[in-house]
């Protein structure tokens, strides 16, 4: 007799989750020299028990504790890009700009881009059908509370000036409900970052509108301000053109504003 | 040519120890996790337990928990087992094998076995 | 009592198939978890035949194949030979017990 089972609105655990984390977390230590002590198995053995046999609507911060150890990595403070709803270009400008860090250039987060997981409670199962929605069913399940927890420390480590690149595209070009506004921002240390510079970046090829206007990006200067932390913000009107700059700095066509 | 080669078997009374070791060449030893299974007299496999590649997770069977302690040695490409208040039902050969890469993935090599005899 | 179960024999005659059978829980092969195979001949250390459900190590011949359905496993040997002789083991991770877990064995005869 098959036995009920809870049906949640979000899609369910990745396909071969377990194989994929493994896989990840042996690419990124073979990458990365200072994370060659990392022992896969046991960050797969903290990442699993952070959620398996645990009520999906029910994870904490602390569930998750074992494998932020395991995880801990240093990265430059001072070289962080945040970014909001425009994750492909913040990872095309770190794959150029290797100094500067997105949270996905970190183990953790390489280890769970774009990845769906939860169990079960009470059985070792992973379940592979379905996984709570975080709108639908409930904000504390194991996707959510691990973005939330990576997010947090990321913003947490940085210092001097922070940028973030913002989706100008997007009705709300801040969103207060975004992990970006939601988490990133209010974990800024104003003891340690000095400035966060937003960088906005357009849409439409003849999009020359000062974005930096945009109430939206007033209403997230107001709340950096309040927490001490000088803002800035700059429009990138050409992103291919900035991604080619990066790349290409001598280029003469770079001199003019991008 | 991979080969894993078990010692430090013999004769034990019960309630005392012994330590196996298990010589791997081959391979490159610390990119897999290694694991004890042992085979009573007439009986089938029984798993002991498991190490992953580098030594920071480990696994044991229920009934061997608190007295077995799975160790490994990277830089001697050597696995071991410490084996305390044995028991007469310890009584096997102890087989070292080469993990199919993860411990989850089952053994690809194994080694020709050393015996244990708890008896007094 | 294995966590895996299989029957305890098994036998066939010489060019017949025959089929091992491996059955499991949620908990271990119903959750995603590899299946592998091992044969042991009389008197010898036991043997990798199928990794990863169905993968054959090289020099496994083809006569040997694993699949897996559900919380279940099978190993199929087709061609039988005198010297398939030997007893079968299943195996796979077990998530509950965070253990690896064997089944009892099958003796294949060969009539």
């Known amino acids: 007799v098959p036995r009920w089972r809870q049906q949640w609105s979000g899609p369910g655990t990745t396909k071969r989750f377990p194989e994929t984390v493994l896989a990840r977390c042996v690419k990124y230590t073979e990458i990365h020299p200072e994370m060659r002590h990392v022992d896969c198995q046991s960050v797969w053995d903290a990442f699993k028990g952070a959620f398996i046999s645990k009520h999906p609507c029910n994870i904490t911060e602390e569930d998750y504790q074992p494998l932020m150890k395991l995880g801990t990595q240093t990265v430059p403070c001072n070289k962080i890009l945040l970014w909001s709803r425009i994750k492909d270009l913040a990872h095309q400008f770190t794959q150029v700009q290797r100094d500067m860090f997105t949270l996905e250039d970190t183990l953790l987060g390489y280890l769970a881009d774009d990845l769906t997981w939860c169990g079960e409670f009470n059985t070792s199962k992973i379940n592979y059908q379905s996984c709570p929605d975080w709108r639908k069913d409930c904000s504390n399940n194991p996707v959510s509370v691990f973005w939330k927890t990576v997010s947090r420390r990321f913003a947490e480590a940085a210092c001097d000036v922070v940028h973030v690149m913002l989706n100008g595209s997007r009705s709300k070009i801040f969103d207060k409900n975004s992990t970006f506004g939601s988490v990133e921002v209010h974990n800024l240390q104003p003891e340690k970052v000095q400035t966060l510079e937003a960088w906005v970046i357009h849409g439409g090829r003849e999009d020359s509108r000062d974005l930096c206007q945009d109430p939206t990006i007033k209403e997230l200067e107001s709340i950096i301000s309040k927490r001490n932390i000088q803002f800035s913000c700059k429009n990138i009107y050409r992103p291919d053109k900035f991604l080619q700059c990066v790349k290409n700095p001598e280029d003469s066509s770079c001199t003019s504003e991008i | 040519e991979v080969q894993l080669l078990e010692s430090g078997g013999g004769l034990v009374q019960p309630g005392g120890s012994l330590r196996l070791s298990c010589a791997a060449s081959?391979?490159?030893?610390?990119?897999?996790?290694m694991s004890w299974v042992r085979q009573a007299p007439g009986k089938g496999l029984e798993w002991v337990s498991a190490?992953?590649?580098?030594?920071?997770?480990?696994y044991y069977a229920d009934s061997v928990k608190g007295r077995f302690t799975i160790s490994r040695d990277n830089s001697k490409n050597t696995l071991y087992l410490q084996m305390s208040s044995l028991r007469a039902e310890d009584t096997a050969v102890y087989y070292c094998?080469?993990?199919?890469?993860?411990?989850?993935?089952?053994?690809?090599?194994w080694g020709q076995g050393t015996t244990v005899t708890v008896s007094s | 009592q294995s966590v895996l179960t299989q029957p305890p024999s098994a036998s066939g005659t010489p060019g017949q198939r025959v089929t091992i059978s491996c059955s499991g829980s949620?908990?271990?092969?119903?959750?995603?978890?590899?299946v592998s195979w091992y044969q042991q001949l009389p008197g010898t250390a036991p043997r990798l035949l199928i990794y990863?459900?169905?993968q054959r190590p090289s020099g496994v011949p083809d006569r040997f194949s694993g699949s897996k359905s559900g919380t279940s496993a099978s190993l199929a040997i087709s061609g039988l030979q005198s010297e398939d002789e030997a007893d079968y083991y299943c195996?796979?991770?077990?998530?509950?017990?965070?253990?690896?877990?064997f089944g009892g064995g099958t003796k294949l005869t060969v009539l």
């Open positions: 094998a080469k993990d199919h890469k993860w411990n989850y993935y089952g053994m690809d090599v």
């Open positions: 195996g796979t991770w077990d998530d509950r017990l965070n253990a690896w877990v």
């Open positions: 190490i992953s590649y580098k030594g920071g997770s480990t």
């Open positions: 949620t908990s271990n092969i119903g959750n995603d978890n590899y």
């Open positions: 081959g391979f490159l030893f610390d990119d897999y996790g």
């Open positions: 990863k459900d169905d």
